[in-house]
């Protein structure tokens, strides 16, 4: 058992029929000595008596808040959450299985730039009595500061028959050195609770490799004359890190049909323009990458041929 | 060419190769992504290899301010890795195919580190550590950690290289 | 301690209120319930009270009996006597806890 | 309400022997469980509390464990003070019943 904040504990238990579960001995915060009666939840039965009370936790119906009274006075509470393990591996029910890059895939990151600033975020079709805690650092022996905030419901999705709930968080290292060759991977550790269960998620990666930049801003196309080239033009997104001739952007360029199956123009470079035939219906598209490390290419930015 | 003494690297050519060493160390191992060997034990291996640090003044003003330090740790780098891919291993079974990029991947690093110190001049180079795995597979993971590493080097070294040849060439 | 008192001999239809007297702790701590056992047979939970003051029912008791609460005591009225309610009525403290105490019982017989 | 069945009604064990009782509950009710002994005209005395917890007072021959929605009360090494009727006491924290007890002869 341990403390996950103030008077909140969680029991570790291993998760299998029959299994003997865990001795728990819950003491009372007060001086006082006797007299002392515990209920679990809402129960209008006493539990026990006196300062401790030991009780066997096997299932979740022993999880939950017990409170300590004297004279009809409450004196403390110790909510106690499960965390169940089977087989020897944690259970992970809280959150979706978003299988990429991998399987077991749990929480995802994103980093816009080089800065320091990532967000996390991830799926579950649990839509009521969860909580979600999020802490974070730069290495894990002598963790350096990350601060993450709040975790908030950002998407909601219907999958099929299921609603499904994204979650995200934004987190910031605090003392970030965008130039350096990172040696120490940011953790990123969520801890999930829904009613009685607990669970920890856990990520560990550098920002270099959870690179996304937003998608070129101010794509613009200028015809040539005489010709049915056009000259392709965007700029950085805002949001990049500078200065560019420092942190540089690759591109790629893209005509394509209307129709998915007509074959793609593609050109690579490293500049802000580029010069393509457009097709009557067809569309240019630009996307980004860091130049230097193939970290993920951003989203499209498009605009039509016509 | 990079003098100790403090005069400045020839950046555009120094901008070209390294952004060409990108580019070999993304073909020899693309897999980004699909292998995470910070699972498997990093300790011994990548601990010594010299990181272009916060302090190493590889940042846009440190560049400004005084190039020298962070290209004598650029050097320091690619004398290591030179180093590493030439070892045994990389040498060693089981034996890379005959078009791997690893070869000119080597050429390369060396190739670098000969334009920032030309013959006679001695900065300081980091010992290598005595790395021989025994088992062929240990190796082969040892490869595949050595070449995530040298992406995230030779990225840095090339962003210093395309902003000094674009804002300190003479 | 706990003791009850109030059982006797009433017809059907009579209105009796059994009470719980207990002494050395305070009934704000402890949830008190009620036990009955007829004659040769099986012991039978009428009902409890609980620390805020609330009382709940065996699903065959609601209506039947009402469970009330004072300072040292606890009343268990039974509300219209029938002759299956022949039975000597236990009180018991905290049937759960380790210091759980029971009564001696009161005796009550409905007969016409 | 849950119902606790109880069993078997009776049983009879030798000095020294050991005696099984068993409560099934009709739903989960984890640690609200208790087991008492009960001799001929006295009041209920409670056993074993939170389901495997000895009340005390008790002798350590008596072992309450639970599985899942089943519980069982064991007498090992049974005394001739044993013979008595036995009861489950099971419920949510708040509606409770009992089993319909267990007569234990000691032969």
């Known amino acids: 058992i341990w403390e996950l904040k103030k008077d909140v504990y969680v029991v570790e238990l291993d998760w299998y029929p029959d299994a003997p579960g865990e001795m728990v001995v819950l003491t009372c915060d007060t001086p006082e000595e006797d007299g002392i009666t515990w209920t679990l939840d809402q129960s209008s039965e006493v539990l026990g008596s006196g300062k401790t009370l030991t009780i066997q936790v096997k299932e979740f119906g022993d999880a939950g808040q017990y409170t300590c009274h004297k004279g009809g006075e409450v004196l403390s509470h110790s909510l106690l959450l499960l965390h169940k393990k089977e087989d020897g591996i944690w259970s992970t029910d809280i959150l979706k299985d978003q299988k990429e890059p991998k399987n077991k895939t749990f929480l995802r990151c994103e980093a816009k730039n080089y800065s320091g600033r990532f967000t996390c975020w991830w799926l579950t079709t649990i839509s009521t009595d969860l909580t979600f805690s999020v802490k974070s650092s730069r290495g894990s022996s002598d963790p350096q500061g990350v601060t993450c905030g709040a975790a908030t419901l950002s998407a909601e999705r219907v999958r099929g028959d299921n609603k499904e709930y994204e979650y995200s968080v934004e987190c910031q290292e605090d003392s970030a050195c965008p130039a350096a060759e990172e040696s120490l991977p940011i953790e990123v550790m969520v801890d999930a609770v829904h009613k009685l269960k607990y669970e920890n998620y856990t990520s560990s990666f550098f920002i270099r490799d959870i690179i996304k930049p937003d998608p070129p801003k101010n794509l613009q196309l200028k015809p040539l004359k005489n010709s049915r080239q056009v000259e392709v033009s965007w700029e950085y997104p805002d949001t990049w890190s500078t200065p560019h001739s420092y942190f540089s952007l690759t591109f790629c360029v893209q005509v394509q049909g209307k129709s998915k199956r007509e074959k793609k123009d593609r050109v690579f470079t490293d500049k802000t323009s580029a010069t393509v035939i457009c097709r009557k219906n067809a569309s240019i598209s630009v996307r980004a990458q860091d130049r230097y490390y193939s970290s993920s290419w951003s989203e499209w930015a498009s605009v039509p041929c016509s | 060419r990079a003098v100790p003494g403090g005069s400045s690297p020839a950046w555009t050519q120094c901008q070209q190769l390294s952004q060409k060493l990108c580019t070999l160390a993304w073909s020899a191992h693309p897999l980004v992504g699909h292998m995470d060997l910070r699972e498997e034990g990093d300790e011994e291996t990548t601990n010594d290899v010299p990181h272009i640090q916060c302090g190493d003044g590889c940042d846009p003003q440190g560049l400004r301010d005084n190039s020298q330090f962070c290209l004598q740790r650029i050097h320091q780098g690619l004398i290591f890795y030179e180093k590493l891919l030439g070892s045994d291993i990389f040498t060693g079974e089981p034996s890379l195919l005959p078009d791997s990029p690893v070869g000119q991947l080597h050429a390369s690093l060396l190739g670098l580190s000969q334009l920032l110190q030309p013959e006679g001049h001695h900065w300081e180079t980091q010992q290598i550590p005595s790395l021989s795995p025994s088992q062929p597979w240990q190796r082969l993971l040892l490869r595949f950690k050595i070449l995530r590493s040298l992406q995230a080097f030779v990225a840095v070294a090339a962003r210093v290289f395309a902003h000094g040849a674009a804002t300190l060439s003479p | 301690s706990v003791e009850e008192s109030g059982g006797r001999l009433v017809t059907p239809g009579t209105p009796l209120t059994l009470t719980c007297t207990v002494s050395?702790?305070?009934?704000?701590?402890?949830?008190m319930s009620w036990v009955r056992q007829a004659p040769g047979k099986g012991l039978e939970w009428i009902g409890v009270?609980?620390?805020?003051?609330s009382a709940y029912y065996a699903s065959w008791a609601k209506g039947r009996f009402t469970i009330s609460g004072a300072s040292t005591t606890v009343d268990l009225k039974i509300t219209s006597p029938t002759t299956e309610d022949t039975a000597t009525y236990f009180c018991?403290?905290?049937?759960?806890?380790?210091?759980?105490?029971w009564g001696p019982g009161t005796l009550v017989t409905v007969s016409s | 309400d849950v119902v606790m069945t109880q069993t078997p009604s009776s049983t009879s064990a030798a000095v020294g022997g050991t005696v099984t009782i068993k409560c099934q509950a009709s739903?989960?009710?984890?640690?609200?469980l208790s087991w008492y002994q009960q001799k001929p005209g006295q009041r209920p005395k409670p056993l074993i509390v939170?389901?495997?917890t000895l009340a005390s007072g008790v002798p350590s021959r008596f072992k309450g464990n639970r599985s899942g929605t089943e519980y069982t009360l064991t007498i090992s090494g049974v005394q001739r003070e044993d013979a008595a009727a036995y009861y489950c006491?099971?419920?949510?924290?708040?509606?409770?019943?009992f089993g319909g007890g267990t007569k234990v002869v000691v032969v």
């Open positions: 018991a403290r905290a049937t759960y806890s380790d210091d759980n105490i």
């Open positions: 050395g702790f305070s009934l704000n701590s402890y949830s």
């Open positions: 009270i609980g620390l805020g003051g």
């Open positions: 739903q989960s009710i984890s640690s609200w």
């Open positions: 939170r389901a495997s």
């Open positions: 006491l099971g419920g949510d924290g708040n509606v409770s019943n």
